[in-house]
Interface confidence: medium
């Protein structure tokens, strides 16, 4: 806590100026008014502040507004932000994208910091959806971004904003998040032609079901391996040699070099030796002839 | 045009002090504050600190902290360095350079001194 | 204490494209402008970029800088002899105001 001193004669703070970087920290705290430091927040960032400095600078907004600061001060906070904690944050009421492009600015290039995961948490929260121009910024600060919320918040993500998601923006996400964003990738696409859907769609197929998946199989959209095996494993299993060939196209070669991975292996095991020679792979593993194939999904829901 | 011009070249005994000058001109003297920046031979940029012409008020590099007391004299458009309980290893060209406003850079600096320390 | 990092020295034959990088933290170039300075041999150093990528006027526009996160770099295309010059990266630092990279010395084949 910085000690309550009298401003020295001739030292009071007119304006925030450069000047002001030769204040000791007393001399900040009893030469700077608050009132005057809020409405030229936007200066600060120019002047060569030290950190030291910036705590007295953020004490005195922190007495001013003690129930969080105002949207016209947080938009101007630029390198003050990163003083910021958490728990000043989530005091914040955050409604324009411009604020937030602004502080999301200051932290270009870093890793996304515990700050910027409150800021982005209460924008969201008070705007009640992930829209897309939101969306949009935040993809474009954060690829990863969308793939760090649970399935529960990409619920709130409407179809119209799935258009601004890159394939790269879905690099880091796992099953369950994929199971969320497919349905609503499905239905923003919907209107499209095949083969433009399915690029769109392409990077959504790990949330597939196997129905989708025998429906691709029919339009020749030579899907390849890499998609193939980010595919849901329940999804693929029941897919047929023949619907496999078809959904891969060219691609299918490339089964050889993964039958020991997941979902290709599992999938082997699930078909007829004799269905996979056709292919001309050598795939090794799958059912000999002569065998009885029980569905045992289908028996235990029959008893 | 804006100019920033040195006093000459210093030789000084380990313990002495030693004082130079920079003449500021072609600009407001007290409009633009002036940094000091030392450089050992052979060696990269040292800031050593900063003055205010407007009201003399000045910020040192924790390094030089009471060794270094930079002044001016606003009536002649000079702004002076004084370094004292010098030592071999302060042997450097020392430049006065000017700060522009609003953004972290020099934009005009003097032609050197070269102060050197020797017994 | 030297918190900017530059490489001692780079070189390249004229007509090519050559690269200086500065490399910081969050308290300097994370969180400021970066500017570069061009030392030729025995003279004073001279403003190259400001504000992480402007060219003051009379600086050739084979000069260009950029930043991203804590690091900057400085990229020099169309190498001439008279290149050959040290080249320092500056910021201020937060935490100990003001900040010069180590300098790199650059050699034109």
């Known amino acids: 806590e910085v000690e309550k001193t009298a401003c020295p004669s001739g030292k009071k703070a007119r304006e925030i100026d450069e000047s002001l970087i030769f204040y000791k920290k007393w001399e900040l705290e009893a030469c700077v008014d608050a009132a005057l430091l809020a409405t030229q927040m936007d200066r600060v960032n120019a002047i060569p502040f030290t950190y030291e400095q910036l705590d007295v600078l953020k004490h005195k907004l922190d007495e001013l507004y003690p129930q969080g600061y105002p949207e016209s001060v947080i938009q101007h906070l630029g390198y003050l932000f990163l003083k910021m904690s958490p728990e000043d944050i989530r005091k914040w009421n955050v409604t324009s994208l411009e604020t937030l492009k602004a502080l999301l600015e200051v932290n270009k290039g870093h890793e996304m910091s515990p700050q910027v995961a409150t800021l982005i948490d209460r924008f969201v929260k008070g705007r009640g959806q992930l829209d897309k121009d939101t969306l949009d910024t935040l993809t474009a600060f954060y690829p990863g971004y969308l793939c760090s919320l649970s399935p529960e918040e990409l619920s709130s993500v409407p179809p119209s904003s799935i258009w601004a998601v890159r394939p790269q923006d879905l690099d880091t996400c796992d099953p369950r998040q994929l199971d969320v964003l497919y349905p609503k990738a499905r239905l923003a696409f919907q209107n499209m032609n095949g083969s433009e859907y399915f690029v769109k769609i392409q990077s959504f197929l790990g949330g597939a079901p196997t129905e989708d998946l025998k429906a691709l199989s029919q339009q020749n959209v030579s899907m390849d391996l890499a998609t193939f095996m980010k595919l849901r494993t329940d999804a693929v299993l029941p897919l047929t040699v023949a619907e496999v060939q078809k959904l891969l196209g060219p691609h299918v070669e490339g089964l050889k070099a993964e039958e020991r991975h997941r979902p290709v292996r599992d999938w082997i095991l699930r078909q007829r030796q004799d269905d996979l020679d056709t292919l001309g792979l050598g795939l090794q593993g799958g059912i000999p002839n002569g065998y009885l194939v029980l569905d045992l999904s289908m028996q235990e829901a029959l008893s | 045009q804006v100019e920033l011009v040195q006093s000459g070249a210093e030789v000084k005994k380990p313990g002495a002090s030693v004082k130079v000058s920079c003449k500021a001109s072609?600009?407001?003297?007290?409009?633009?504050?002036i940094n000091w920046v030392r450089q050992a031979p052979g060696q990269g940029l040292e800031w050593m600190g900063i003055?205010?012409?407007?009201?003399?008020?000045?910020k040192y590099a924790q390094k030089f902290q009471g060794r270094v007391t930079m002044t001016r004299d606003t009536s002649i458009s000079t702004a002076y360095m004084e370094l004292s309980s010098l030592r071999s290893e302060d042997t450097a060209v020392y430049y006065c350079?000017?700060?522009?406003?609003?953004?972290?850079?020099?934009?005009?600096w003097g032609q050197g001194t070269l102060v050197t320390v020797s017994s | 204490d030297i918190v900017l990092t530059q490489p001692p020295s780079v070189s390249g034959a004229p007509g090519q494209r050559v690269t200086i990088s500065c490399s910081g933290s969050?308290?300097?170039?994370?969180?400021?402008?970066v500017s570069w300075y061009q030392q030729l041999p025995g003279t004073a150093p001279k403003l190259l970029i400001y504000?992480?990528?402007q060219r003051p006027s009379g600086v050739p526009d084979r000069f260009s800088g950029s930043k991203s996160g804590t690091s900057a770099s400085l990229a020099i295309t169309g190498l001439q002899s008279e290149d050959e010059a040290d080249y320092y990266c500056?910021?201020?630092?937060?935490?100990?105001?003001?900040?010069f990279g180590g300098g790199t010395k650059l050699t034109v084949l």
């Open positions: 500056s910021t201020y630092d937060r935490r100990t105001f003001s900040v």
């Open positions: 072609g600009y407001t003297f007290t409009g633009n504050y």
């Open positions: 504000n992480d990528n």
């Open positions: 969050s308290s300097n170039i994370g969180s400021n402008y």
């Open positions: 350079a000017r700060w522009h406003h609003g953004t972290w850079i020099f934009d005009y």
């Open positions: 003055i205010n012409p407007h009201g003399g008020d000045t």
